[in-house]
């Protein structure tokens, strides 16, 4: 999906009002210095591309974050403020339902959410280019 035509200010507002708080809640009890950020993003479409991939793609040691509150709110924000996003996600959502597993907060998941926080902060930077 090409995130170029999203309403970035509306997504930023959603992040500031709720998503950021849900990310903090998920990370509660973790020191902010515990994980090194190894990925970043260039402009807002890039940030959303990486946020969507990191949030919804299973990775080694962290099977799924998709059912977490921050992930559901991220998905809702993208569906509302990125034209055509919902249609591209139908097949992906069906596949995700098939492989849904019991939620377990592993250290790898905490590390992944720490990376997500960094990507969202970068998205939120006032000087970041729209595209």
């Amino acid at each position: 999906y090409d995130f170029t035509n999203c309403d970035f200010e509306k997504i930023k507002a959603a992040y500031l009002s709720t998503i950021s708080k849900d990310l903090i809640t998920y990370m509660s009890g973790t020191k902010s210095t515990e994980f090194n950020n190894t990925v970043s993003c260039s402009n807002r479409p890039h940030c959303l591309t990486e946020i969507q991939s990191l949030t919804f793609n299973p990775t080694a040691g962290c099977a799924s974050l998709a059912k977490e509150m921050f992930a559901m709110k991220t998905k809702a924000a993208l569906a509302i403020w990125c034209p055509g996003y919902s249609e591209t996600q139908i097949n992906a959502t069906q596949a995700m339902k098939k492989r849904r597993k019991r939620k377990v907060t592993t250290n790898k998941c905490l590390e992944q959410v720490s990376q997500l926080q960094g990507l969202w902060r970068r998205f939120n930077r006032p000087l970041l280019k729209q595209q």
């Epitope: 990925v39 591309t49 990486e50 990775t59 080694a60 280019k129």
Partner: antibody, heavy 117, light 108 residues
């Protein structure tokens, strides 16, 4: 300390597909960072080709996108480049590099690929 | 596509002298700029990122400055091992990261 090593044929015929592999040691490619390909034609500057992130997102240079595929094999700690329909203009030293998706902090030593019949 | 223009193409200096390399972007890249050093037959090495932050292990004689469209890499006192080609790279314009054409610093 992370080390990267490119491997693959040094000579490719025009119209064929260039295939290179980067083997990473000292760091798991599924643990963090992005893993990128960059090329440098002889005596010229650098051109970014694309990356695959540790979580699988892929990004390509738009000027090469129609011909490029980057993939990975986490079991071997390797990532690969395929460039189709090559011409003499694709003759270059090809580097693999570690990236934070913005800039490139560790590089392989590079491998020269010549496109010629 | 953002075009990065480096000047001069070649800089002839003696060890101990100060080197000032310029990189200009065709449009603003904020501080999203990196500098690399490349010696003959070797891969590039990251020197500076975010326009002014030194990469791990890079000596203090290397410094970067600038924002927007005009950037400078300064080598305060050239060591023999600093004679090389230097490239700037912008990362403001994903997915079109671009490099400058390079500045060669040679021994006078």
């Amino acid at each position: 300390q992370v080390q990267l090593q490119e491997s693959g044929p040094g000579l490719v015929k025009p119209s064929e597909t260039l295939s290179l592999t980067c083997t990473v040691s000292g760091y798991s490619i599924s643990s963090g960072y992005g893993w990128s390909w960059i090329r440098q034609p002889p005596g010229k500057g650098l051109e970014w080709i694309g990356y695959i992130s540790y979580y699988g997102s892929i990004s390509y240079n738009p000027s090469l996108k129609s011909r490029v595929t980057i993939s990975r094999d986490t079991s071997k700690n390797q990532f690969s480049l395929k460039l189709s329909s090559v011409t003499a203009a694709d003759t270059a030293v090809y580097y693999c590099a570690r990236t934070n998706l913005l800039y490139f902090d560790s590089w392989g030593q590079g491998t020269l690929v010549t496109v010629s019949s | 596509e953002i075009v990065m223009t480096q000047s001069p193409a070649t800089l002839s200096l003696s060890p101990g002298e100060r080197a000032t390399l310029s990189c200009r972007a065709s449009q603003s890249v904020s501080n999203n700029l990196a500098w690399y050093q490349q010696k003959p037959g070797q891969a590039p090495r990251l020197l500076i990122y975010d326009a002014s932050s030194r990469a791990t292990g890079i000596p203090a004689r290397f410094s970067g400055s600038g924002s927007g469209t005009d950037f400078t890499l300064t080598i305060s006192s050239l060591e023999p091992e600093d004679f090389a080609v230097y490239y700037c790279q912008q990362y403001s314009d994903w997915p079109q990261y671009t490099f400058g054409q390079g500045t060669k610093v040679e021994i006078k």
